[in-house]
Amino acid sequence: SEGRKTWRRRGQQPPPPPRTEAAPAAGQPVESFPLDFTAVEGNMDSFMAQVKSLAQSLYPCSAQQLNEDLRLHLLLDTSVTCNDGSPAGYYLKESRGSRRWLLFLEGGWYCFNRENCDSRYDTMRRLMSSRDWPRTRTGTGILSSQPEENPYWWNANMVFIPYCSSDVWSGASSKSEKNEYAFMGALIIQEVVRELLGRGLSGAKVLLLAGSSAGGTGVLLNVDRVAEQLEKLGYPAIQVRGLADSGWFLDNKQYRHTDCVDTITCAPTEAIRRGIRYWNGVVPERCRRQFQEGEEWNCFFGYKVYPTLRCPVFVVQWLFDEAQLTVDNVHLTGQPVQEGLRLYIQNLGRELRHTLKDVPASFAPACLSHEIIIRSHWTDVQVKGTSLPRALHCWDRSLHDSHKASKTPLKGCPVHLVDSCPWPHCNPSCPTVRDQFTGQEMNVAQFLMHMGFDMQTVAQPQGLEPSELLGMLSNGS
């Protein structure tokens, strides 16, 4: 999946002038102005050029312009560690004018027994140790401080928390004579939050806990605990929210069942079942109470844990997620897809769509991909004409307005965006797919034929000729 797709921009129209909001009252910290994109979806590039020039005129002496990097801080409490006992940490880029804090949890699968953790340690050590972490990282996508790359929250305080606990951010066990590895994912989050309070988080208005892949599942597992932690520490006014990207997995039946020998081929339920025991994993209290002892693994699956959460969570999930397909033993490697597999893949999209029907804030494009929010071109994909940054902006507004009794969605500002077309890449704004063997970009028609879809069969239920359907797909209608 990684690096396999390029992103393309669609044609855009010129924008009307942007709307501004009233200035803050005297003595209030200056907040980044929320941008209302209602009228400017058409030509984001031109609008962003205006915003950038405005932003730069507002910060003539600011280091913001000069330095895009987040700086590494290893935890002061060195008992909170990565797998190998080295201190965990976080990368931070402060934005002193802002009361928004974005904490991003990195992803990277997991390991669930001594053998596959040993192998992970010897091949992917940066995911188990802080010993070789770079001093700085560049923020990309939702972690970017450039308004054109991150129209949603470019001016927030940005925190990237590297994943070095291999436990889907759930573990609470330290390294000992008995345990070769520490699994402290849940404790790392708590300690990062505690240390950030001394670095300005105490004055936050909103804390958005975001994450991709295993980090996305980590959001679902930890968002309520973070809210509870801040309340207990005397900061009940900080609104805690979650943004879970590519971490909403299904405990479905694998396409081909294989024994649980490694992380990739092990069925997700079995991997998590084994993992929880190995990591001493903790799950949200309200979810845990819904399941018997030994059944806590259920809480790692979004559709089961989500209804138990108190904090608002926005779910971002590709309908045909590559990590989901991997654990389901579906490997698309360039051979045309047989009908049984094609139906399995279509059904996966249908099942996923069904699990999101009661998730009011969701963005689920019908694409074959994995992760989105820290990709530089995360703004490019649209569902029903709305981009993800725009949907997140609408979500912010809906939460801001939620003290009003009305539960109706804001007019022209949707937050429930789930593609309804039934096959991979039926959404023309999907990331471009490359043929895995030739490296060539494939258009939608080539991709669908490669996937074994007969254009006649696809077009018929829509009441279209195959040529008409292809035209529509190519034009993005």
Epitope: E2, D118, T123, H331
Partner: antibody, heavy 119, light 111 residues
């Protein structure tokens, strides 16, 4: 200077046993996963076995499972490969290789030791 | 196990021209932003030498005429311009999961 030096090869009869060694120097041996790779005459490379950095996990290719035992002595910076029930198809050059821990690629190879299984 | 299929088995390239070797995996070897495919060069009587790691990173000391690309399950090694000393056998190798495996090799001859 990082170095790996294999020894213990030679001529062995079918059904016999042999213990190969790999002496490491110039790096912290206990920090790295170590592997054996072999190459039959005029053939390609075949991955044989892996020992984790701590020595707690070993993994073998199916072709050698049950006949090979991999071990390491981190205090002596040495990797061992004990081979039993040897067959003619085990005839090969045996290389010991260090796996980088930021990707598992073999960034350092020994010169190899040649094993011939023949009567 | 992940099977690596290398092609062609051999190729002859004129001095100064481009050599392209392909390596296909039976399933994706990419995860968490990295592709776990590596390329080695082996000359007769010598151990293999690392050229490219993680699909596209050039090992230090290796000439810039060697380059690697690809992700997912499809990878390519390019040599351009080919020099006399590049005559050797080239192997791809994956380290995505155990057991590791190698491709069958491509023998490059300089015309």
């Amino acid at each position: 200077d990082v170095q790996l030096l294999e020894s213990g090869g030679g001529l062995v009869q079918p059904g016999g046993s042999r213990k190969l060694s790999c002496a490491a120097s110039g790096f912290t041996f206990s920090d790295f996963g170590m592997h054996w790779v072999r190459q039959a005459p005029e053939k390609g490379l075949e991955w044989v076995a892996y020992s984790s950095s701590g020595g707690t996990t070993v993994y073998y290719a199916d072709t050698v499972k049950g006949r090979l035992t991999l071990s390491r002595d981190n205090s002596k910076n040495t990797l061992f490969l004990e081979m039993t029930s040897l067959r003619s198809e085990d005839t090969a050059m045996y290389y010991c290789a260090r796996a980088s821990y930021d990707g598992g690629y073999f960034d350092c190879w020994g010169q190899g030791t040649s094993l011939t299984v023949s009567s | 196990d992940i099977v690596l299929t290398q092609s062609p088995a051999s190729l002859a390239v004129s001095l100064g021209q481009r050599a392209t070797i392909s390596c296909r995996a039976s399933k994706s070897v990419s995860t968490s932003g990295y592709s776990y495919i590596h390329w080695y060069q082996q000359k007769p009587g010598q151990p293999p030498k690392l050229l490219i790691y993680l699909a596209s990173d050039l090992e230090s000391g290796v000439p810039a005429r060697f380059s690697g690309s690809g992700s997912g399950a499809a990878f390519t090694l390019n040599i351009h311009p080919v020099e006399e000393e590049d005559a050797a056998t080239y192997y791809c190798h994956h380290s995505r999961e155990l057991p590791f495996t190698f491709g069958s090799g491509t023998k490059l001859e300089i015309k």
